[in-house]
Amino acid sequence: ECVTRLFKDIHFEGGDIATVFTPSAKHCQVVCTHHPRCLLFTFTGESASEDPTQWFTCVLKDSVTETLPRVNRTGAISGYSFKQCSHQISACNKDIYVDLNMKGINYNSSLAESAQECQERCTDDVHCHFFTYATRQFPSLEHRNICLLKHTQTGTPTGIMKLDKVVTGFSLKSCALSNLACIRDVFPNTAFADSNIDSVMAPDAFVCRRICTHHPGCLFFTFFSQEWPKESQRNLCLLKTSESGLPSTRIKKSKALSGFSLQSCRHSIPVFCHSSFYHDTDFLGEELDIVAVKGHEACQKLCTNAVRCQFFTYAPAQASCNEGKGKCYLKLSSNGSPTKILRGTGGISGYTLRLCKMDNECTTKIKPRIVGGTASVRGEWPWQVTLHTTSPTQRHLCGGSIIGNQWILTAAHCFYGVESPKILRVYIGILNQSEIKEDTSFFGVQEIIIHDQYKMAESGYDIALLKLETTVNYTDSQRPICLPSKGDRNVIYTDCWVTGWGYRKLRDKIQNTLQKAKIPLVTNDECQKRYRGHKITHKMICAGYREGGKDACKGDSGGPLSCKHNEVWHLVGITSWGEGCAQRERPGVYTNVLEYVDWILEKTQA
């Protein structure tokens, strides 16, 4: 069961698997959640011990029964991992801790104007896990305003001491706030030299990349595939680092694949969740349980529901045996990866989906789309919202997209003449406008944030954020879409759709059912030729068929231009303007969301 509360003055007895240092019990809980085996923890605050070296210790614990004896101990704080919970989990920790110094390897010292600047420097430094900043009041003159960047092997401090007039905190890479380059390519027939910091077994290069991404020291990796000549190294994932942060040497090696950690990427692809099945493959590890079930999907579900299960192997039933039930072997290991991977065994293996909730919600796979047809089905575009105005009478005003649990991204031009957010209603999870009745629940708008350089749609900056009065609970029919990542600047999107309840032709009315149209992107040069009287800037993106026929139209404004890349949907554009609707050689013009990611993050994370 999910227990989120912390137990003050309680120590959990036994079950120790590791001890780390954390600045707070809350952070200890996050570390426990991300540790492959930790189910419970005990944190020792500064009042709990006479010995300062014991302050801020976070003891990670495991238990077969998922519980441990409780002992009264002043100053101790205990609790449970969030692995048992269904809510989203994030390693992001924006807290700044006053008068604490987190110890690590200090590898960079420089002056900074503020703790925030120091934290940003850490976030944008490939090696930095956490920092300490000496404030203007620090006793030592030469150390005032010094920003120390630090790293450790584990990503957690090697100790935490009280130190007056300093502040300390963590890198915000796990908050998807880094400006570092994000290299998503996986390079075939390539091995990287450089030092190995760890090695694990992985069934493919993408799982290897995900493991690298959430290993604190891994910057890039090399994976030896099943076809690798040296048998003992098959399926071996080597986690690597270097002083520069980049591989020093690329070696051509057949059947090896290499790539980079995605730690600095902004949202966009799942890094914890390994959802694939591996056929004719056995994952070896410590056995938790063996259960007879029907099919490998059922086996994965069983593993996901068993909190200590990390991966599984399903042995299909022999013909007409056991009512078609095969054996489901639930397994675990010290690091969450199989100890060995065997091929050609007839088994079907995979991982728990419990870790999927550590990824950004926007990366979750949605229902397969119905191809063809122009009417959407429920849950097909779960980020699409309908924005209504209640003045003078209630009507659909614009589309919009969920990008966070309190944020809708839409177009600035939608708010022409809108004097107050009080007249706005956001309806989420809606397929048909006819579903909206007097008593239909909606989200009120707390604030409208229009880009301060917006003047009119045709001159750009046609972007706005709506802050909702209450938060959205994500379900299959209402969830966010990923923002594009700076690292995706060179991606060529080929699967793009525009959606909305807008007109189907120039003189029409708002549609009842959410419409969809697959539309190809058009280069800005091509688009500029079609709109000689306008300036098509890099902050705009165009889409449309040369012959016309499919396009966004009145009422679609503010809605998404959604493009699928690497199995994840990205909000590439916001429906903005165009000449007529679906006219020949007049593509639709959309706000290029990629160019506004910093603006969006600045406003939503203020």
Partner: antibody
Framework: QVQLVQSGAEVKKPGASVKVSCKAS????????MHWVRQAPGQGLEWMGI????????SYAQKFQGRVTMTRDTSTSTVYMELSSLRSEDTAVYYC?????????????????WGQGTTVTVSS | EIVMTQSPATLSVSPGERATLSCRAS??????LAWYQQKPGQAPRLLIY???TRATGIPARFSGSGSGTEFTLTISSLQSEDFAVYYC?????????FGGGTKVEIK
């Protein structure tokens, strides 16, 4: 062992400039600040300024502002102090001195290693 | 700037005797004070930092005390090699400033 070796004595005419070097060895050059202090004949010590060899940031005493420039070359672990528009009262022994260890935060420190000094004579 | 005043300007002491040197700051420098020893023709040498902490290799006969604006350097039993000029220096605010020095000479 840790040492700072300064360049040799200089004789300059008024209005000229002088550039004194200070080569560090035996420690990580970029991890400590470096101060420049001068001492006129028979006088006390006078602080001129400081440089952080890691980032190259500097802070100068108001008296020398506009006339002094402190630089560093991390490849040779050397700091330089250039004083321009020299006048006779700039005749002094110029010292470089190692300051705080900047890779760790602690409250108190002093200038723990000094160069041998460079005599600069300004005379027409 | 913070003005550092040392007294006396000259102190005549016999070997084996105790010497007490004083340093006053024009405003509080907390414990951000260092003491140096300088012999003729040589560079200064750090004795004490943080008002009372002896630098590496400095004999125990040297001790520092005080905080705020009043500081003292004590040499418990003067040795022949201790006859020199002693400077105090504040590290509390830019610009760093030195006292005028106290010359300890043989009585």
């Amino acid at each position: 062992q840790v040492q700072l070796v300064q360049s040799g004595a200089e004789v300059k005419k008024p209005g000229a400039s002088v550039k004194v070097s200070c080569k560090a060895s035996g420690y990580t050059f970029t991890s400590y600040s470096m101060h420049w202090v001068r001492q006129a004949p028979g006088q006390g010590l006078e602080w001129m300024g400081i440089i952080n060899p890691s980032g190259g940031s500097t802070s100068y005493a108001q008296k020398f502002q506009g006339r002094v420039t402190m630089t560093r070359d991390t490849s040779t672990s050397t700091v330089y102090m250039e004083l321009s528009s020299l006048r006779s009262e700039d005749t002094a022994v110029y010292y470089c001195a190692r300051g705080a260890y900047l890779m760790e935060l602690y409250y108190y420190y002093g200038m723990d290693v000094w160069g041998q000094g460079t005599t600069v004579t300004v005379s027409s | 700037e913070i003005v550092m005043t040392q007294s006396p300007a000259t102190l005549s002491v016999s070997p084996g005797e105790r010497a007490t040197l004083s340093c006053r700051a024009s405003q509080s420098v907390s414990s951000n004070l260092a003491w140096y020893q300088q012999k003729p023709g040589q560079a200064p040498r750090l004795l004490i930092y943080g008002a009372s902490t002896r630098a590496t290799g400095i004999p125990a006969r040297f001790s520092g005390s005080g905080s705020g604006t009043e500081f003292t350097l004590t040499i418990s039993s003067l040795q022949s090699e201790d006859f020199a000029v002693y400077y105090c220096q504040q590290f509390n605010d830019w610009p760093l400033t030195f006292g005028g020095g106290t010359k300890v000479e043989i009585k």
